[in-house]
């Protein structure tokens, strides 16, 4: 019989009949090792590969370029998949991006982008997006005209300041832009008036730090 093809992403996992959310192993083009990822099979039809998740503040997101490059954390909880993996996955085919957010009052919202990919390391993992929709604000809280990725030890932003140092975490900062989902985790009651929190400007404003976030991608042709 025909040899089974390894899963390139969670869409492949879903289409192979595995429709329960959880951790799966995928094999990404041009990556030497397989990668464990969390697959969300429940939201909007399933097949989503989770590239970022925040939920409880248990993981430190104030890390350097190398760690954001290769990823950190555990797909069963808080984690960053890794820019190198995000680049490799989104180079395989066309992807969309969905971002699920929840505030400390229990309100949920999402932002979705019809096209999402990032550049390679030489391009500072530059963000490319198109077609924003969703309930987390009429305008996009991710920079649509493109922004380079910055970390505390790699200042690629568009500011006289050092956004990643000031706002903490690695992100596609502009100067410093309307979002930072990798900022400091603040608990309920401490989450207002924060310059360096988990921010999605067009959902909760410039200084409200969110309770949970999930960034996930899925092929356009799913």
């Amino acid at each position: 019989r025909e040899e089974e093809k390894p899963f390139r992403d969670c869409a492949d996992v879903y289409q192979a009949g595995f429709n329960k959310s959880g951790i799966y192993t995928i094999y990404i083009n041009n990556m030497p090792e397989p990668k464990k990822v969390f697959c969300n099979m429940d939201v909007n039809g399933g097949g989503w590969t989770v590239i970022q998740h925040r939920e409880d503040g248990s993981l430190d997101f104030q890390r350097g370029w190398k760690e954001y490059k290769m990823g950190f954390g555990n797909p069963s909880g808080e984690y960053w998949l890794g820019n190198e993996f995000i680049f490799a996955i989104t180079s395989q085919r066309q992807y969309m991006l969905r971002i699920e957010l929840m505030d400390w009052e229990g309100n949920r919202a999402y932002s979705q982008y019809d096209r999402f990919h990032i550049g390679n390391e030489k391009q500072n993992y530059r963000l490319y997006l198109k077609g924003h929709t969703g309930t987390a604000g009429k305008q996009s809280s991710l920079i649509l005209h493109g922004a380079d990725f910055s970390t505390k030890d790699a200042d690629n932003d568009n500011c006289m300041c050092k956004c990643a140092l000031m706002l903490t975490g690695g992100w596609w900062f502009d100067a410093c832009g309307p979002s930072n989902l990798n900022g400091m985790f603040y608990t309920a009651g401490q989450n207002h008036g924060k310059l360096n929190g988990i921010k999605w400007h067009y959902f909760k404003g410039p200084s409200y730090s969110l309770r949970s976030t999930t960034m996930m991608i899925r092929p356009l042709d799913f």
């Epitope: 500011c159 006289m160 100067a175 832009g177």
Partner: antibody, heavy 122, light 112 residues
Framework: EVQLVQSGGGVVQPGRSLRLSCAAS????????MHWVRQAPGKGLEWVSY????????YYADSVKGRFTISRDNAKNSLYLQMNSLRAEDTAVYYC???????????????WGQGTLVTVSS | DIVMTQSPLSLPVTPGEPASISCRSI???????????LDWYLQKPGQSPQLLIY???NRASGVPDRFSGSGSGTDFTLKISRVEAEDVGVYYC?????????FGQGTKLEIK
């Protein structure tokens, strides 16, 4: 390159009006809060007025409240200061200044215009 | 309005020597988010002011590392480790914690 180019200064009699302009380029003007700061001859710096990125939030120093009006035209990348009922004590170099950070996050002034002199004298 | 007091008002320095400027506020500038909204600006002769330090201790891009800011609450200091001729001008501290923003009266640094 970020640039703030000012115009509109000059000599004006007390009680009269003047309008200052600040043309912005090299950045997404509509994403930044903008300010006017003035400096009387031989004196220090004094904040005058602020307008948020969308124009929805405006503040004035007590010394100019009711006489000065700050406005912006994001389509034209321009900031304005309409100065009415001018007094001798309004004589100063007026600077437009851009917030360091975008999206109305206040941390000070990242860029300044070249300044324009307003002289109120009879 | 918050009064910002700088000292000294005049600072003659020999090139290569260190310099220090103090800035005091009548109220704490430390916000609940952990940041002191205190900036330092330099106005060189005949020029517009330029940002040196933001949020108390963060050097703006392009500012030489001989400039450093420190302090928290009500007492802040700008230090220049080795003064150069191009550092002459008037230095202002500015607070942005309490609206409206207010400036210190300025410290004039000159070369001996």
């Amino acid at each position: 390159e970020v640039q703030l180019v000012q115009s509109g200064g000059g000599v004006v009699q007390p009680g009269r009006s003047l309008r200052l302009s600040c043309a912005a380029s090299g950045f997404t003007f509509s994403s930044y809060g903008m300010h006017w700061v003035r400096q009387a001859p031989g004196k220090g710096l004094e904040w005058v007025s602020y307008i948020s990125s969308s124009g929805s939030t405006i503040y004035y120093a007590d010394s100019v409240k009711g006489r000065f009006t700050i406005s912006r035209d994001n389509a034209k990348n321009s900031l304005y200061l309409q100065m009415n009922s001018l007094r001798a004590e309004d004589t100063a170099v007026y600077y437009c200044a851009r917030d360091l950070l975008d999206y109305d996050i206040w941390t000070g002034y990242g860029y300044w215009g070249q300044g324009t002199l307003v002289t109120v004298s009879s | 309005d918050i009064v910002m007091t700088q000292s000294p008002l005049s600072l003659p320095v020999t090139p290569g020597e260190p310099a220090s400027i103090s800035c005091r506020s009548i109220q704490s500038l430390l916000q609940s988010n952990g940041y002191n909204y205190l900036d330092w600006y330099l106005q060189k002769p005949g020029q517009s002011p330029q940002l040196l330090i933001y949020l108390g201790s963060n050097r703006a891009s392009g500012v030489p590392d001989r400039f450093s800011g420190s302090g928290s609450g009500t007492d802040f200091t700008l230090k220049i480790s080795r003064v150069e001729a191009e550092d002459v001008g008037v230095y202002y501290c500015m607070q942005g914690t309490h609206w409206p923003p207010t400036f210190g009266q300025g410290t004039k640094l000159e070369i001996k």
